[in-house]
Interface confidence: low
């Protein structure tokens, strides 16, 4: 294997770095961009989709969780398979699964089916990160590897920017919708879900033009196929550099004898499904065996250390980046509540209310013979009030409650004032006629605040750009470990600044700072993971570590967001401790700069 690694490095040097790698860079970049988009889709559509699908808080939480769960399963599954079946083939299948179910999720109406589609869409895209980095690294010579893998990371950021920009451009346009009867509705948020499937679809189209990784071929004893691909790399680069006459001089490449080839059984043995069953079991056994070998004597220490680094990084990064918008929403809510207008002891008779009431408390009021027609109530509370001979018609409300109120001879016609909006209230001789159809839940709706989140995410992902550029330029100069540890320490320091962010704009600026600093850690971690494992274990290990990363993300998000409105200190402390632990673990890993790809 060492001999193959040295020879392969020499061949890649001869092939040069040029048009072939740059083409592959953009193709794989699209696949990575699809992953960057996936993380944001559900969060962005929730404010709009919650009304359409009548989502309770637990439903919304489950929807957010299911994406990470899907990506976790997908990373492990496709990562393992890509070491056995090939990088290109598995990436094509995983992206196809992603696009098909992302496409379906745009059209399905029910919550259950939407959840299922997003789960499978997540499973599909889960394969993107582990395969893309391994695949690209196998076309890069040692001197350029760190830098160009870091440039590739930029596409994850581009995915986030794309998702935020599209959400901003599409979701607020209520006009972009149609209805087929009362049962089928296609609103603008569904257009957004559809548009978010584009990077994945384009990646599939572009990937069909690219060859399989020659290193994978060599690892699986396919000498001729590997030679053809390497010749294609060489010839493409030489033609682009104006040297078409240069000949690919390699005649023989060392290959590894493949011992555990897929079990093949003769076509006359049993039914087709039995044959496929045997193949699947055989493949599953090989994938599992390969995974367990990452914990064998040779790799156990590296794997455990990498698990620690991936977990702490992900826990703090995802925890904080989801906590930020929640914190901003909390600050907005506090500010909104501070501006609540209180109306004590109103006595209103023979008046027609036909306008919007927002952010008000009416206390101890008496309403006699009043009409509430075509009224919009947003965050309005009526407390200890009396309504007598009143008439409510075409009333829509959100976050509106009647507490300890008495209604006498009052009629409610075509309103969404459902039972739960009357708290300890008494209704005497009052009737509800033709309550509004649809969702009986109180949804926050899509106000300016909801759309503000798209802009914040847009800024947050864009702020990563400088950190990305710096880390790419320095990756091969200062080394992966210094980059990882240094960036983790800087992220840790930037964490502490969060304690001073009391305004919305300060929190956004600090989110940008944290994102910009921590991206270098992610880039270094991706490069390290690719280089620490041999080619027959590379995507398996990467997939497992990426799955662990998603698990840590879910834990981080759950723990951090539970402190919103209680304390800022706990999340900051947790994140700082995790980052400090991560950087100390990172320093114990072996440096891979200047190393040939095993």
């Amino acid at each position: 294997r060492e001999e193959l690694a040295q020879q392969y490095e020499a061949i890649l040097r001869e092939c040069g770095h040029g048009r072939f790698q740059w083409t592959l860079y953009f193709v794989l970049g699209l696949a990575l961009m699809a992953d960057g988009v996936e993380v944001f889709v559900v969060g962005f559509v929730l404010p709009s989709a919650e009304k359409d699908m009548c989502l309770s808080d637990s439903n919304k939480g489950m929807l957010g969780l299911i994406v990470y769960l899907g990506m976790m399963v997908g990373a492990f599954l496709w990562g393992g398979l890509a070491d056995r079946l090939g990088r290109r083939q598995c990436l094509l299948i995983s992206l196809s699964v992603n696009s098909v179910f992302a496409f379906f999720s745009s059209f399905v109406q029910g919550y259950g089916t939407f959840l299922f589609c997003r789960l499978l869409s997540g499973v599909g895209i889960g394969g993107s990160i582990p395969i893309v980095f391994s695949y690209f690294s196998e076309f890069l010579a040692q001197e350029k590897r760190g830098e160009h893998l870091s440039w590739l990371c930029m596409f994850w950021m581009i995915g986030g920017v794309y998702a935020a920009a599209m959400a901003w451009a599409i979701i607020p346009h209520y006009g972009w919708s149609f209805q087929m009867g009362s049962a089928y509705q296609f609103h603008s948020w569904r257009v957004f879900v559809l548009v978010c499937a584009f990077p994945s679809v384009f990646a599939i189209g572009a990937l069909t033009t690219q060859p399989e990784s020659p290193r994978f071929f060599l690892e699986n004893g396919k000498h001729d196929e590997a030679w053809m691909v390497l010749k294609q790399v060489h010839d493409t680069n030489m033609r682009a550099k104006g040297h078409p006459e240069r000949v690919f001089s390699v005649t023989h490449i060392k290959t590894i004898h493949q011992e555990d080839e897929l079990i093949e059984i003769q076509s006359d043995t049993g039914a087709w499904y039995q044959r496929w069953g045997v193949r699947a079991l055989s493949l599953g056994g090989q994938v599992w065996g390969n995974f367990l070998s990452c914990f064998g004597p040779e790799y156990r220490r590296i794997t455990l250390m990498m698990m620690g680094v991936w977990f702490t990084m992900s826990f703090s990064y995802y925890g904080l980046t989801v906590w930020f918008p929640d914190m901003i929403r909390h600050l907005q809510a506090v500010d909104y509540a501070a501006r609540t207008k209180v109306f004590p002891g109103e006595r209103v008779e023979h008046v027609t209310f036909n306008f919007t009431l927002e952010n008000q408390i009416h206390r101890g009021g008496q309403y006699f013979n009043d009409k509430f027609i075509g009224l919009r109530l947003k965050s309005v509370s009526f407390e200890d009030s009396l309504f007598e001979e009143c008439y409510f018609e075409d009333v829509t409300s959100s976050n509106t409650f009647f507490r300890n109120c008495t209604f006498i001879n009052t009629v409610f016609y075509n309103t969404d004032l459902f039972e739960y909006k009357f708290v300890n209230s008494r209704l005497v001789n009052s009737t509800f006629l033709h309550n509004k159809e649809g969702c009986p839940l109180d949804v926050t709706g899509t106000g300016e605040g909801a759309y503000m989140v798209y802009f914040v995410s847009f800024l947050g992902t864009l702020a990563v750009l400088p950190g990305n550029i710096v880390s790419a330029l320095l990756m091969d100069k200062i080394g992966r470990l210094r980059m990882l540890a240094g960036s983790s320490v800087m992220s840790c320091v930037s964490c502490f600044f969060l304690s001073f962010g009391n305004s919305e704009s300060a929190m956004i600026a600090l989110l940008c700072l944290f994102g910009g600093v921590s991206i270098a850690s992610w880039n270094a971690l991706d490069v390290l993971t690719v280089e620490l494992y041999p080619s027959d274990k590379r995507t398996t290990a990467f997939g497992f570590l990426n799955a662990l990363c998603k698990l840590a993300a879910v834990l981080g998000i759950s723990i951090f967001t539970s402190f919103v409105g209680i304390t800022k200190a706990a999340p900051i402390l947790f994140a700082s401790a995790a980052l400090a632990l991560g950087s100390s673990l990172a320093l114990k890993l072996p440096e891979t700069r200047g190393q040939v790809l095993q």
Epitope: K341, F343, P344, G345, R347, V348, V351
Partner: nanobody, 119 residues
């Protein structure tokens, strides 16, 4: 758009009385609280008296006992009865629609009415 027209101002000797009126249009008068404000030369505009839609009144300390705010919902008018006037009451008086005491009024300001109490 809420429109406000103040009237009833004038010049009066110290200890005298005046009754200011304010006609309101462009809003459902009976559901809104109303306030009388004044602006003395070179000073900020300040709220001096307030009446809720239910008829509850509030005053600033320096006019309490001398000024009385009242409203007539049938005429969409709010009044300010000013007794025992002092030279320091000299100002332009405005009325406006306010959801509550201390909250920003939301009508567009009228021309106001000048009250002068010579020393």
């Amino acid at each position: 758009q809420v429109q406000l027209v103040e009237s009833g101002g004038g010049s009066v000797q110290p200890g005298g009385s005046l009754r200011l009126s304010c006609a309101v249009s462009g809003t459902i008068f009976s559901i809104n609280g109303m306030g009388w404000y004044r602006q003395a030369p070179g000073k900020q505009r300040e709220l001096v008296a307030y009446i809720t839609s239910g008829g509850t009144t509030s005053y600033v300390d320096f006019v309490a006992g001398r000024f009385t705010i009242s409203r007539d919902n049938t005429k969409n008018t709010v009044y300010l009865q000013m007794n025992s006037l002092k030279p320091e009451d000299t100002a332009v008086y405005f009325c406006n629609v306010a959801r509550n005491w201390g909250l920003e009024p939301f009508g567009s300001w009228g021309q106001g009415t000048q009250v002068t109490v010579p020393p």
